[in-house]
């Protein structure tokens, strides 16, 4: 049986007992700015190239033990959600990882900026097909981080980011508040906004759309064949990065505006229970859950 | 995300440091009437004081960025402050990343080509 999240983003006409998840995104490179990853995990081996980029702060606390599987946990899971063989969205997409988050999942605005600059320089040195940049991280509103995202977007790169897990207005966070970035909130199997402890998904007019972000099965760094369930707006953003990769692979000439329009067009409308959001934010928050197109050129999305 | 909105600062703090009239030995003064601004994260625990991104005006070349960074170091040294240039940006935004005392912000804001300065802050896996 298909994991609920893959079923949710798949158009009904492709659902069947013998469902083979879509195998697309092969013309697209997805950059992941996150923790280190276990690149030879069975789900993602050969699909993720670990770049030599690393810019992370030291871990907090004198008694912190650097355990490899924990250091790799967040990034490995997200790489699996984007392009994993069995539980991934865009099974044909190749990925490149940059380490901007330390073993505690913490990074800096400056490290992220240098990472974005690295991507731009790589793009200039060796132009490839369409690029998607996944930023599964958030900090406070940052003029400079938003400006860097804007510049990269204007260079033709599609940026997808997590709305944030603070149960707050996404406009107060970066890169979620950057207008050129596709900002993704998280919903669950009941199409409810995701609650995470006392907090939950961010909301508001800086969110572009929502995607599955609760109990998402993906590669676990605990072992080379392990899977684990994780939740958050990072997982939601990874779904949209995968969908974007598939759309761009099918139509490589799409502009950012056209891609955004398609993402919105193919989303499920008005399925989210808005009562979860603060009253003043309900009208501002898009009631959209991301989905793949029920493609007329089927072979492009479902090879 | 969500195109079409204007940049909203929210709780974001913008501290405009007025430029003093004296030129402080600069070869080029900032353009008349422009005031470089200082920004920092509104969420105090996420702030990383002591590291700053100095963002220069859009058309600034790499050589000018490097010169501006060196000028800041020289002027800071004259005041007895150690500074360290951690990275010079080019390709996306012109500017540089500097480790320095917050006491030097007023001086840094007066440098030629400076558009704004942002204190570094934390980001987190979501």
């Amino acid at each position: 049986s298909i994991p609920w999240n893959l079923e949710r983003i798949t158009p009904p006409r492709y659902r069947a007992d013998e469902y083979q998840p879509p195998d697309g995104g092969s013309l697209v490179e997805v950059y992941l700015l996150d923790t280190s990853i276990q690149s030879d995990h069975r789900e993602i081996e050969g699909r993720v190239m670990v770049t030599d980029f690393e810019n992370v702060p030291e871990e907090d606390g004198t008694r912190f033990h650097r355990q490899a599987s924990k250091c790799d946990s967040h990034g490995t899971h997200l790489a699996g959600v984007v392009s994993g063989r069995d539980a991934g969205v865009a099974k044909g997409a190749s990925m490149r990882s940059l380490r901007v988050l330390n073993c505690q999942g913490k990074g800096t605005v400056s490290g992220t900026l240098i990472g974005l600059e690295f991507i731009r320089k790589s793009q200039l040195v060796q132009p490839v097909g369409p690029l998607v940049v996944l930023l599964p991280l958030a900090g406070g509103y940052s003029r400079v981080l938003n400006a860097a995202c804007q510049r990269l977007a204007r260079a033709g790169v599609v940026l997808v980011t997590a709305a944030g897990n603070f149960r707050d207005d996404a406009c107060l966070y970066s890169p979620a508040s950057a207008p050129e970035v596709i900002t993704v909130g998280a919903t669950n199997a009941q199409d409810q906004p995701v609650t995470l402890g006392t907090l939950g998904t961010n909301f508001g007019r800086c969110v572009d759309l929502f995607a599955p972000g609760e109990d998402i099965i993906g590669a676990s760094s605990d072992c080379s064949t392990c899977f684990v369930s994780q939740s958050g707006t990072s997982q939601a953003a990874a779904h949209v990065a995968g969908i974007a990769a598939m759309m761009l692979s099918a139509e490589p000439e799409l502009t950012l505006a056209e891609l955004r329009q398609r993402l919105i067009h193919f989303s499920a409308k008005d399925v989210i229970n808005e009562a979860w959001f603060p009253e003043d934010q309900r009208v501002l928050t898009p009631n959209l859950v991301a989905a793949l197109p029920p493609s007329t050129h089927e072979n492009l999305y479902f090879q | 995300g969500a195109m079409g909105q204007e940049d909203e600062d929210g709780d974001y703090e913008e501290l405009v440091l007025a430029l003093r009239s004296e030129e402080d030995g600069l070869a080029e003064a900032p353009e008349h009437g422009t005031t470089a601004t200082f920004h920092r994260c509104a969420k105090d625990p996420w702030r990383l004081p002591g590291t700053y991104v100095v963002v220069l005006k859009e058309e600034t070349h790499l050589s000018q960025s490097e010169r501006t960074a060196r000028r800041l170091q020289a002027q800071a040294a004259r005041r007895g402050y150690l500074t360290k240039i951690l990275h010079v940006f080019h390709g996306l935004l012109p500017g540089f990343l500097v480790k320095m005392s917050g006491d030097l912000l007023e001086l840094a804001l007066k440098l030629p080509h400076v558009d704004y300065i942002e204190e570094d802050s934390s980001v987190f896996a979501q």
């Epitope: 998840p21 690149s39 030879d40 081996e45 050969g46 670990v50 063989r85 069995d86 080379s224 064949t225 | -």
Partner: antibody, heavy 115, light 109 residues
Framework: QVQLVQSGAEVKKPGASVKVSCKAS????????ISWVRQAPGQGLEWMGW????????NYAQKFQGRVTMTTDTSTSTAYMELRSLRSDDTAVYYC????????WGQGTTVTVSS | QSALTQPASVFGSPGQSITISCTGT?????????VSWYQQHPGKAPKRMIY???NRPSGVSNRFSGSKSGNTASLTISGLQAEDEADYYC?????????FGGGTKLTVL
């Protein structure tokens, strides 16, 4: 191009150990693990286990647990498979292959166990 | 881990099509999209012909195709040629390991 080159044939006595090497080239060594597969004369392929070139973690087939050790040396992009307490039925060709995907194979190393 | 079930031998004439089946369980073939097919000529290392059920690596003839239904995967070779005579093995992920089929000897008559 991507290549896996294995060490030469070995003849061992029952009870001894054998260590086969597999040198990788033409790709980023740590992006894939190494699988080890053996084939007894006239028999089919048998998966023995996998070793991570990224962090050294291993995943052994239950049948070989306790008798096999798989390791990697990232400085030389080489993987090793050591099989202990050899028996005559361990006589086989031992192959290394790239990752779980096993898309590229070594040429094979013949190990003969005979008294 | 018991091997996946393949027919011991299959015969075909040049130009014909043949299909080799590979039957597993809901814990291996049925559960994963990672079924591969390997061709092995005598005295040679195996060569991957199909991966992830139906994908062909570059350089492999489009006469080779793969599919899966439930717990059974299939390899089809169309327009059979003399050089296709070889042993063919399927493999699949299991929850923790890998498992091969027992192998099928293809004879081109």
């Amino acid at each position: 191009q991507v290549q896996l080159v294995q060490s030469g044939a070995e003849v061992k006595k029952p009870g001894a150990s054998v260590k086969v090497s597999c040198k990788a080239s033409g790709y980023s060594f740590t992006s894939y693990g190494i699988s080890w597969v053996r084939q007894a004369p006239g028999q089919g392929l048998e998966w023995m286990g996998w070793v991570s070139a990224y962090n050294g973690n291993t995943n052994y087939a239950q049948k070989f647990q306790g008798r096999v050790t798989m390791t990697t040396d990232t400085s030389t992009s080489t993987a090793y498979m050591e099989l202990r307490s050899l028996r005559s039925d361990d006589t086989a060709v031992y192959y290394c292959a790239r990752g779980y995907v096993m898309d590229v194979w070594g040429q094979g190393t013949t190990v003969t166990v005979s008294s | 881990q018991s091997a996946l079930t393949q027919p011991a031998s299959v015969f075909g004439s040049p130009g014909q099509s043949i299909t080799i089946s590979c039957t597993g369980t809901s814990s291996d073939v049925g559960a994963y999209n990672s079924v591969s097919w390997y061709q092995q000529h005598p005295g040679k290392a195996p060569k991957r012909m199909i991966y992830e059920v139906s994908n062909r690596p570059s350089g492999v003839s489009n006469r080779f195709s793969g599919s899966k239904s439930g717990n059974t995967a299939s390899l089809t070779i169309s327009g059979l040629q003399a050089e296709d005579e070889a042993d063919y093995y399927c493999s699949s992920y299991t929850s923790t390991n890998m498992v091969f089929g027992g192998g099928t000897k293809l004879t081109v008559l």
